[in-house]
């Protein structure tokens, strides 16, 4: 027999037949025939299929390997894969999050613009004039120089991007 013009959504064409696809979470056991429907079976424990499909095998859930700094962010179901993220202080090296690296620290003279997350690294920025950072840190922002004036003191040593200003007493004019 000539094949049908087109199959509908959630169907596939095989042997001139429009057969039903298996729903997410189930795999194909046997194609439909002229007299029998498509046969599907649920995926097993630790397996999934996330689309309408004609797969004969379900996919294995992703393993979040602790040796690579990974942990489970969201447990997989029969219809979804496991989502991994990184342990505290680490972030994913790729969108797929297959391994982790330690968050970068911002060197002295640089402050944290954006704190790292499980999927993004620390973003550093140079301390602008009037600000400094004297430590290597993954959390510290640039700090503003001390205002000597508000303490009724004067600047004895100018600040840099790595050091704070040094304040001292005002010189008293002798009578």
């Amino acid at each position: 027999p000539e094949p049908p013009t087109a199959c509908r959504e959630k169907q596939y064409l095989i042997n001139s037949q429009c057969c039903s696809l298996c729903q997410p979470g189930q795999k194909l056991v046997s194609d439909c025939t002229e007299f029998t429907e498509t046969e599907c079976l649920p995926c097993g424990e630790s397996e999934f299929l996330d689309t309408w499909n004609r797969e004969t095998h379900c996919h294995q859930h992703k393993y979040c390997d602790p040796n690579l700094g990974l942990r489970v962010q969201q447990k997989g179901t029969s219809e979804t894969d496991t989502i991994c993220t990184c342990e505290e202080g680490w972030h994913c090296t790729s969108e797929a999050c297959e391994s982790c690296v330690l968050h970068r620290s911002c060197s002295p003279g640089f402050g944290v613009k954006q704190i790292a997350t499980g999927v993004s690294d620390t973003i550093c920025e140079p301390c602008p004039v009037g600000f400094f950072s004297n430590v290597s840190s993954a959390f510290e922002k640039c700090h503003p120089w001390t205002s000597c004036e508000t303490k009724d003191l004067v600047v004895q040593q100018a600040g840099t991007n790595k050091t704070d200003v040094v304040c001292g007493p005002q010189d008293r004019l002798r009578a």
């Epitope: 429907e37 046969e39 079976l41």
Partner: antibody, heavy 126, light 107 residues
Framework: QVQLVQSGAEVKKPGASVKVSCKAS????????IHWVRQAPGQGLEWMGW????????SYAQKFQDRVTVTRDTSINTAYMELSRLKSDDTAVYYC???????????????????WGQGTTVTVSS | DIQMTQSPSSLSASVGDRVTITCRAS??????LGWYQQKPGKAPKRLIY???SLDSGVPSRFSGSRSGSEFTLTISSLQPEDFATYYC?????????FGGGTKVEIK
């Protein structure tokens, strides 16, 4: 309640085109296929084609392939069937109908047309 | 294309009679068949879907069955309102095809 309301009767000359509309209400328009079926006077039912309102995908009977165009406007829940190069034997009542389906045994099954429009009479005469 | 051969094309019966209409598919269509009733000047109305499932609101005197590629609509006890034309429809794949119809008339 679920309803399909079609446009009014048309009288056309041979060679002209006709466009019949089918407005859906009472359900989510994009969830179900719309089919077009015609019936010539004193004759049986003849399937013309379907549209998936969600994707816009269509399928037509070979007989009408080069003359029929089925479209939809999801903003107004309406499907259209346009038949061109009309001939006198295109005189018929044209129906739109909704096709339902259901989930079962890990699949989605189609169940044919459950709700029909009231029909639109198209007369082709010189 | 899948051909649907419907028989008989017409029949005369009396109220209370058991009526059987048959459709044979030119190839296997699984259970993907419906039965429709049409009265003059009206749109078709579905009675049966998936070969044997009764539509809601349809009297239980209507039933459908399948044996291989042969499908049967049975009206167990014909009522006055059942005089109409009946069509089978296969919706297994495009193109969908109807049987030629069976006109049930009063004897």
């Amino acid at each position: 309640q679920v309803q399909l309301v079609q446009s009014g009767a048309e009288v056309k000359k041979p060679g002209a085109s006709v466009k019949v509309s089918c407005k859906a209400s009472g359900y989510t328009f994009t969830d179900y296929y719309i089919h077009w079926v015609r019936q010539a006077p004193g004759q049986g039912l003849e399937w013309m084609g379907w549209i998936n309102p969600n994707s816009g995908d269509t399928s037509y009977a070979q007989k009408f392939q080069d003359r029929v165009t089925v479209t939809r406007d999801t903003s107004i829940n309406t499907a259209y069937m346009e038949l061109s190069r009309l001939k006198s034997d295109d005189t018929a009542v044209y129906y739109c109908a909704r096709e339902v389906g259901g989930y079962g045994s890990g699949t989605y099954r189609y169940y044919g047309m459950d709700v029909w429009g009231q029909g639109t009479t198209v007369t082709v005469s010189s | 294309d899948i051909q649907m051969t419907q028989s008989p094309s017409s029949l005369s019966a009396s109220v209370g009679d058991r009526v059987t209409i048959t459709c044979r598919a030119s190839q296997g269509i699984r259970n993907e068949l419906g039965w429709y009733q049409q009265k003059p000047g009206k749109a078709p109305k579905r009675l049966i879907y998936a070969a044997s499932s009764l539509d809601s609101g349809v009297p239980s005197r209507f039933s459908g069955s399948r044996s291989g590629s042969e499908f049967t609509l049975t009206i167990s006890s014909l009522q006055p309102e059942d005089f109409a034309t009946y069509y089978c429809l296969q919706y297994s794949g495009s193109p969908l095809t109807f049987g030629g119809g069976t006109k049930v008339e009063i004897k």
